[in-house]
């Protein structure tokens, strides 16, 4: 990601004058190097503050997990604290439901509910007050071409992810389709390989938009192929945040 | 993007004469006279705002870990007018990095950083305060089927765009995958044309979701195929906006 | 929608969900537009139907959203394309689909792409197909800026309130 360092930030110091020039330059640098941190330390000693320390890390989220060195975790910073109590918001993470269905997790990983927002798989998401909400959803899908080769049309699958309003204060009428996305996938097969499944394919179907919701209305996600949902971390989620 | 620093912003400092020697001596005095009070003021100004200190890390989610040294974004470096000073937000635009990498532009075109939000390619995006953020990313990809026809499986490529969190209050260990999109592309070939590349294909992999972040945590994008990124305007970007 | 199985908006089949007059003291500029289903060979944005609305200063002029006040806005748009398979004998030329949100501003002498997605579809290989493109991001906009869209593949749009939309809200 580009080695960004002092050379890139400070320009090239090309001293071609006398020895004194070099000394003077060095003096200037040393002056700065001593004066600034000492002053900083002096001021910080006198002023109450909540600063993080020096952070050095090695981070590679690739195949091997590598160790993070020297992180300073401040004791008062609890990750599960509700950081924004006044704002109705939710972020729900896809989780397998018994019987190959798509369920949603409200507490694990990055999932959360704030400010009276309620959720369960059966009931959907209920927002606590009337307002303008930005609703969003992403569903990751994965699959393989079935064995047997043959007609590519027979292998095509159209994946749909939809967000509906229904139930609660909305009432018992037709659930209202709010936002939806779709993607047709045609998995490939090696013509030479007549038996066996094709390689894994992946796709994501996502969307987001503004919807005016009333307190007690319920919002839920409907998907066409629950058996193809990719539950890998970060792939499948939906949420809402009040914006007005 | 490369190494952005004083060289790019302030010209090269080239001392070539004895006149400069005298200037250098004076500089040393002036340095002290200016550095101390300015540092005091700067520290006093920054402390109440909960600013993080120096961050040094080795973070490359690709194959090689490259080092980013001491990148400090000074508060006065605001690209154009900050239209809403109270709102931490950022929109970064994909730009080629030396060696076929994906870098991010913070000032050109529609890119911006507001309210203490900091960014470097080495360290990612650092948000200045605890809160609920809507994070988003879209990466455009393009390519051609390689020449020679053959096995369609061999032509398939699964493109992934991922958003990770690391550092700060989040603590040590492997960076945390927050949100991810994926798309498998199988470029088609004209069976009549046995040699030469296939037609251009295009796709986009994007997502967005709410994440509760703390000051000092950094967010960065990881992609599977930097060589296939489409840098055309509006195609590749990532950003964050505080919503609560 | 025959052949692709997307159901029309339930709002068309059930009673209209009442529009909300939000009683918040701090209404923020916001807009959500939907593609006009009656215009099959163009993409015209509508703000006065179904769930579409203009709020607190946003206006729609010449098919563009006019930004009411300077600030940071989240801008988003989605389109869904559909099509039928060609007959096996027909030679399938790739279909180029694209959707872009553009900014026209006094600061620029031309339309600037803000959000852009494109896709090549090969209908000959597939039965009826669907493809959606969604994108959204935050932008610093100035009062009077115009937000518009450009789409390639308009005849293939699935024009329903849930599939083709364009919006923005102040942050």
């Amino acid at each position: 990601m580009g080695a960004l360092g002092l050379e890139g930030r400070g320009g090239r110091l090309q001293g071609r004058g006398s020895l004194l020039l070099a000394v003077a330059g060095a003096t200037s640098l040393v002056t700065l190097l001593l004066a600034v941190p000492i002053t900083v330390l002096a001021v910080l000693a006198l002023v109450p503050q909540d600063q993080g320390g020096l952070v050095t890390e090695t981070a590679d989220p690739g195949a091997q997990a590598q160790q993070g060195l020297g992180f300073q975790k401040l004791p008062e910073e609890e990750p599960e604290t509700d950081l924004s109590p006044g704002l109705p918001a939710a972020h729900l993470i896809g989780a397998p439901l018994k019987g190959q269905g798509l369920g949603w997790e409200t507490t694990k990983e990055q999932a959360f509910l704030t400010s009276g927002t309620q959720f369960s798989d059966a009931e959907g998401l209920a927002l606590p007050q009337d307002g303008l909400y930005y609703l969003y959803c992403l569903v990751g899908y994965r699959g393989r071409a079935p064995p047997g080769g043959g007609d590519p049309q027979g292998r095509s699958v159209t994946l749909r992810s939809s967000l509906y309003r229904a139930g609660g204060a909305y009432g018992p009428g037709t659930p209202e389709l709010l936002l939806e996305g779709a993607e047709t996938v045609t998995p490939v097969l090696d013509p030479a390989r007549r038996q066996g499944y094709g390689p894994l394919w992946y796709t994501s179907v996502g969307f987001g938009g503004l919807v005016q919701l009333r307190r007690g209305e319920r919002v839920y996600v409907n998907i066409s192929h629950p058996d193809m949902v990719d539950f890998a971390r970060g792939k499948t989620f939906f949420g809402a945040v009040m914006v007005g | 993007m490369g190494a952005l620093g004083l060289e790019g912003r302030g010209g090269r400092l080239q001392g070539r004469g004895s006149l400069l020697l005298a200037v250098a001596g004076a500089t040393s005095l002036v340095t002290l006279l200016l550095a101390v009070p300015i540092t005091v003021l700067a520290v006093l100004a920054l402390v109440p705002q909960d600013q993080g200190g120096l961050v040094t890390e080795t973070a490359d989610p690709g194959a090689q870990a490259q080092q980013g040294l001491g990148f400090q974004k000074l508060p006065e470096e605001e690209p154009e007018t900050d239209l809403s000073p109270g709102l931490p937000a950022a929109h970064l635009i994909g730009a080629p990095l030396k060696g076929q990498g994906l870098g991010w532009e913070t000032t050109k075109e529609q890119a911006f950083l507001t309210s203490g939000t900091q960014f470097s390619d080495a360290e990612g995006l650092a948000l200045p305060q605890d809160g609920l953020y809507y994070l988003y990313c879209l990466v455009g990809y393009r390519g051609r089927a390689p020449p020679g026809g053959g096995d369609p499986q061999g032509r398939s490529v699964t493109l992934r765009s991922s958003l990770y969190r690391a550092g700060g209050a989040y603590g040590p260990g492997t960076p945390e995958l927050l949100l991810e999109g994926a798309e498998t592309v199988t470029p088609v070939l004209d069976p009549a044309r046995r040699q030469g590349y296939g037609p251009l294909w295009y796709t986009s992999v994007g997502f967005g979701g709410l994440v509760q972040l703390r000051r000092g945590e950094r967010v960065y994008v990881n992609i599977s195929h930097p060589d296939m990124v489409d840098f055309a305007r509006g195609k590749t970007f990532f950003g964050a906006v505080m919503v609560g | 929608l025959p052949g692709v199985g997307l159901t029309p908006s339930a709002a068309q089949t059930a009673r209209q969900h009442p529009k909300m007059h939000l009683a918040h003291s701090t209404l923020k500029p916001a807009a959500h537009l939907i593609g006009d289903p009656s215009k099959q060979n163009s993409l015209l944005w509508r703000a006065n139907t179904d769930r579409a609305f203009l709020q607190d200063g946003f206006s729609l002029s010449n098919n563009s959203l006019l930004v009411p006040t300077s600030g940071i806005y989240f801008v988003y748009s989605q389109v869904v394309f559909s099509g039928k398979a060609y007959s096996p004998k027909a030679t399938s030329s790739p279909l180029y689909l694209a959707h872009e949100v553009q900014l026209f501003s006094s600061q620029y002498p031309f339309h600037v792409p803000l959000l852009s997605s494109q896709k090549m579809v090969y209908p000959g290989l597939q039965e009826p197909w669907l493809h959606s493109m969604y994108h959204g991001a935050a932008f610093q906009l100035t009062q009077g800026d115009q937000l518009s869209t450009h789409t390639d593949g308009i005849p293939h749009l699935v024009l329903s309130p849930s599939t083709v939309f364009f919006g923005a809200f102040a942050l």
Partner: antibody, heavy 116, light 107 residues
């Protein structure tokens, strides 16, 4: 006109299974959830579970998860409930009801009698 | 599971009367309460959803109110066709549960 037409009464032996049906007409079958309830003689209603005809996803009251299996046949716009390992306590009238939570249309009920 | 209690299992009233049937939940159900009418022949109809919203086609003589754990159904100007058993149902927390029913008879 919306109608939910349930299958006729059933007399079954203990330990056996029975599959009752609910034929929907007059609306888009995949657009609404289908619920199932039971009412034992002279008693109140109990909610058994709900199925989404669009994709077959179902939710069960834990009390009935080993007793009932919900399915749909989209081609015939019919919802089915199979009752397993029946005992005399399963003798009741079973209803289907359309709705996400509140149910605006109900079937006429299917009487199931478990007796040797 | 949330328990729904209808304290009055049967009541009788005269034609033209105003009748109130109450229902209590074992915990706060945030207005997610529904009322049904079951006629003597077993036919079930939806009357009210989300505490107070009248289902289409239901006469305005029927009304609902309440919050938290306490809810009620009121029938004003009682008519012969109102002879039925009335059930409350919570749809706040899975699994949905019904009250024991209140059988209304005409004096």
């Amino acid at each position: 006109e919306v109608q939910l037409q349930q299958s006729g009464p059933e007399l079954v032996k203990p330990g056996a299974s029975v599959k009752i049906s609910c034929k929907a007409s007059g609306y888009s079958f995949t657009g609404y959830f289908m619920n199932w309830m039971r009412q034992s003689h002279g008693k109140s209603l109990e909610w058994i579970g709900r199925i989404n005809p669009y994709n077959g996803d179902s939710f069960y009251n834990q009390k009935f998860k080993d007793k009932a299996t919900l399915t749909v046949d989209k081609s015939s716009t019919t919802a089915h409930m199979e009752l397993l390992s029946l005992t005399s306590e399963d003798s009741a009238v079973y209803y289907c009801g359309r709705g996400y939570d509140a149910m605006d249309y109900w079937g006429q009920g299917t009487s199931v009698t478990v007796s040797s | 599971d949330i328990q729904m209690t209808q304290t009055t299992s049967s009541l009788s009233a005269s034609l033209g009367d105003r009748v109130t049937i109450s229902c209590r939940a074992s915990q706060d159900i945030s207005n997610f309460l529904t009322w049904y009418q079951q006629k003597p022949d077993g036919t079930v109809k939806l009357l009210i959803y989300y505490t107070s919203k009248l289902h289409s086609g239901v006469p305005s003589r029927f009304s609902g109110s309440g919050s938290g754990t306490d809810y009620s159904l009121t029938i004003s100007n009682l008519e012969p066709g109102d002879i039925a058993t009335y059930y409350c149902q919570q749809v706040s927390k899975f699994p949905w549960t019904f009250g024991g029913g209140a059988k209304l008879e005409i004096k």
